[in-house]
Interface confidence: medium
Amino acid sequence: SAPGEDEECGRVRDFVAKLANNTHQHVFDDLAGSVSLSWVGDSTGVILVLTTFHVPLVIMTFGQSKLYRSEDYGKNFKDITDLINNTFIRTEFGMAIGPENSGKVVLTAEVSGGSRGGRIFRSSDFAKNFVQTDLPFHPLTQMMYSPQNSDYLLALSTENGLWVSKNFGGKWEEIHKAVCLAKWGSDNTIFFTTYANGSCKADLGALELWRTSDLGKSFKTIGVKIYSFGLGGRFLFASVMADKDTTRRIHVSTDQGDTWSMAQLPSVGQEQFYSILAANDDMVFMHVDEPGDTGFGTIFTSDDRGIVYSKSLDRHLYTTTGGETDFTNVTSLRGVYITSVLSEDNSIQTMITFDQGGRWTHLRKPENSECDATAKNKNECSLHIHASYSISQKLNVPMAPLSEPNAVGIVIAHGSVGDAISVMVPDVYISDDGGYSWTKMLEGPHYYTILDSGGIIVAIEHSSRPINVIKFSTDEGQCWQTYTFTRDPIYFTGLASEPGARSMNISIWGFTESFLTSQWVSYTIDFKDILERNCEEKDYTIWLAHSTDPEDYEDGCILGYKEQFLRLRKSSVCQNGRDYVVTKQPSICLCSLEDFLCDFGYYRPENDSKCVEQPELKGHDLEFCLYGREEHLTTNGYRKIPGDKCQGGVNPVREVKDLKKKCTSNFLSPEKQNSKSN
């Protein structure tokens, strides 16, 4: 874990002069109102900044926009508003940036009332040029790119039409009417729900789920009595109304909706909801809301088919009203997730899992922190993390937890140390081992970002007063240096760095404010001269992830395998560089019973790793059905945890039981499916 700050803080020499030479100010002369920023492509250095200003007139609001472009990571900007004919761009649609490095951008313009359709501006050369296109409809949503082909766009119209373009927005065709929700699936497939009797709201629970695999030439109805649907990993989920009452259930398909299985999850009533918290090609985390306005529910984790679910975490905080949950995927270490639970006493506590939801535990108390007033025992308490819920409650939390896949093991978050989350002003904590151990990194709330794959962490104090100081660390948050980036303080509005944490540039956005003038300003700081040399082999050290007991042969085994990483030494001040690739060495572990989950009809008694047959199937277990057809369930009671790669060791093969429990999903019996062509 990261040791606390000590006397031997490695200071970066002459950093003020080095950073001053690499600090670029840009004042946006005619700028106010709101500003939005988008990166176009990866490693291109192209940033688009769209500013909008609403002019209040007596009867209506008239808006104006400016569009700026940088191609050097924000050091310089050029006003390119003339490329969009000085048109007002609708910020609620944002800037639709194409997938991967397609260089495509779509801006949706405001058009005067009474026009036949909307207007878009399209670029396919990283915003060097734009083409104006008048639409045959008024868009309701932002243009959605097909993940497989950035020339294919879809959009919903204000009249609930589903429109598709095959030539990057040049020509549009309405492929279906009465559409509520549409999403791209894999292989340029479109899934969408339709209503029959008037509106999406009126028909909720009676919608039909459709699929087109050829951009609207032909269609297939793949679901009826639909409430909503969602895609996660390779799974297609639909919540379907029950025949007999107002409850609904989750059905899952892994073949794009051709066949469905009822998920072994509780049904929910009108006031409840399901939510896919996270999904990959192996499994899914599903939240099922409790009855009543409790603000919590239960997390279930699926098997590899998305059908059998294990209860993962009770009393999981997920507010019904605002739809806030603290569920966070820690992307810097495999299998790690953090979330909050609502205790019996209504306090909120943070829980962490290191094995993809198998077991949850409290976060270890940071060595360099004392327990706060929420702690009954001043020597025993935990770290509690502030995330979306705290932000929604307007606590002094400027940022959600941060982790990056290429900054292995690093997690940064606001938190408090006690028995539960505190409403007091939080501090910033860091973990360098994926959440096993934590250290207080900065006093008070801050904005923070990771640069150069973890080689630099940058932070700015969250303050209502103007600021002119940035903090940075080259040793994963142990030691901090401060740099005054401007003489005249600015009202800070945000930190911007290129997604992916590979960049060495950070942009500080804000505005200068005097009684008569308000101007946006950005300062872009390039840290390349701080990290003077490229990292070499000697700068890296071997680190075993998930290591808790080095004496144990199985130490580091999570989901059947362990991984050793090459990690940058904290004392090394060097550039990982833009082309840095995480180096890891996996090794397979022997299987134990913990590598298996209990299959349908089986459960694990308290403190036992064996799966035992349920004496009788009750409630939703009884209704559970496989593949949407009547069939006998045969199982040996165990199923390998999704993504688990263990080999050898314990092999829980035993007599295959025929549970002889008939269960039916008449949601989609084959006779209910039909096809049609345009």
Partner: antibody, heavy 124, light 106 residues
Framework: QVQLVQSGAEVKKPGSSVKVSCKAS????????ISWVRQAPGQGLEWMGG????????NYAQKFQGRVTITADESTSTAYMELSSLRSEDTAVYYC?????????????????WGQGTTVTVSS | DIQMTQSPSTLSASVGDRVTITCRAS??????LAWYQQKPGKAPKLLIY???SLESGVPSRFSGSGSGTEFTLTISSLQPDDFATYYC????????FGGGTKVEIK
């Protein structure tokens, strides 16, 4: 249509303080500045200072520095001007006005909406 | 602070006359100048902002010009309703008003 409604006339003794309020209705309060301008009998207009309600950012004319305090309450869309250590020369009509600012492409720079004025008389 | 000098302080004119009022700033204020009209017992009314932009609802006989340090308010054809006091106001840094020009009936 935005309106600024000021508090009623005041009669004050020399050395005391006066606090005049200015309530905005019918439009956005926060995006503009509010200026305070006074006019002594038979004299011209004199700017005292102003505030940006969005951040409570106040600015004062040199002449009134230390003697005037301008505040704003966003929740009630009300601005206040307090003048202390009153003397007979402070007898005047005090106006609040919505002040356009150099923000954005709409350089709305004048004081386009005015309150009805509050007469403050300082007399022993 | 920037000083604003308005001239003349009083101006006698008749209905239909073309009237010009000038305002001089002690240093350059770019175009950050506004003109107001005030009648006795009433609050001032904005006529021109940003030196030459006409406030909505103001008759087109009013116009403003100038930049830097020299500014002019022109009433192309004086109407009975135009007899009032006119003030210029700069807005570059702290705000200051000119001393006023009273337009009275000749």
């Amino acid at each position: 249509q935005v309106q600024l409604v000021q508090s009623g006339a005041e009669v004050k003794k020399p050395g005391s303080s006066v606090k005049v309020s200015c309530k905005a209705s019918g439009g956005t309060f926060r995006n503009y500045a509010i200026s305070w301008v006074r006019q002594a009998p038979g004299q011209g207009l004199e700017w005292m200072g102003g505030i940006i309600p969005i951040g409570g950012w106040a600015n004062y004319a040199q002449k009134f520095q230390g003697r005037v305090t301008i505040t704003a309450d966003e929740s009630t869309s009300t601005a206040y001007m307090e003048l202390s250590s009153l003397r007979s020369e402070d007898t005047a009509v005090y106006y609040c006005a919505r002040q356009g600012r150099k923000t954005g492409y709409y350089y709305y720079y004048g004081m386009d909406v005015w309150g009805q004025g509050t007469t403050v008389t300082v007399s022993s | 602070d920037i000083q604003m000098t308005q001239s003349p302080s009083t101006l006698s004119a008749s209905v239909g006359d073309r009237v010009t009022i000038t305002c001089r700033a002690s240093q350059s204020i770019s175009s950050w100048l506004a003109w107001y009209q005030q009648k006795p017992g009433k609050a001032p009314k904005l006529l021109i902002y940003k030196a030459s932009s006409l406030e909505s609802g103001v008759p087109s006989r009013f116009s403003g010009s100038g930049s830097g340090t020299e500014f002019t308010l022109t009433i192309s054809s004086l109407q009975p309703d135009d007899f009032a006091t006119y003030y210029c106001q700069q807005a570059d840094g702290h705000i200051t008003f000119g001393g006023g020009t009273k337009v009275e009936i000749k």
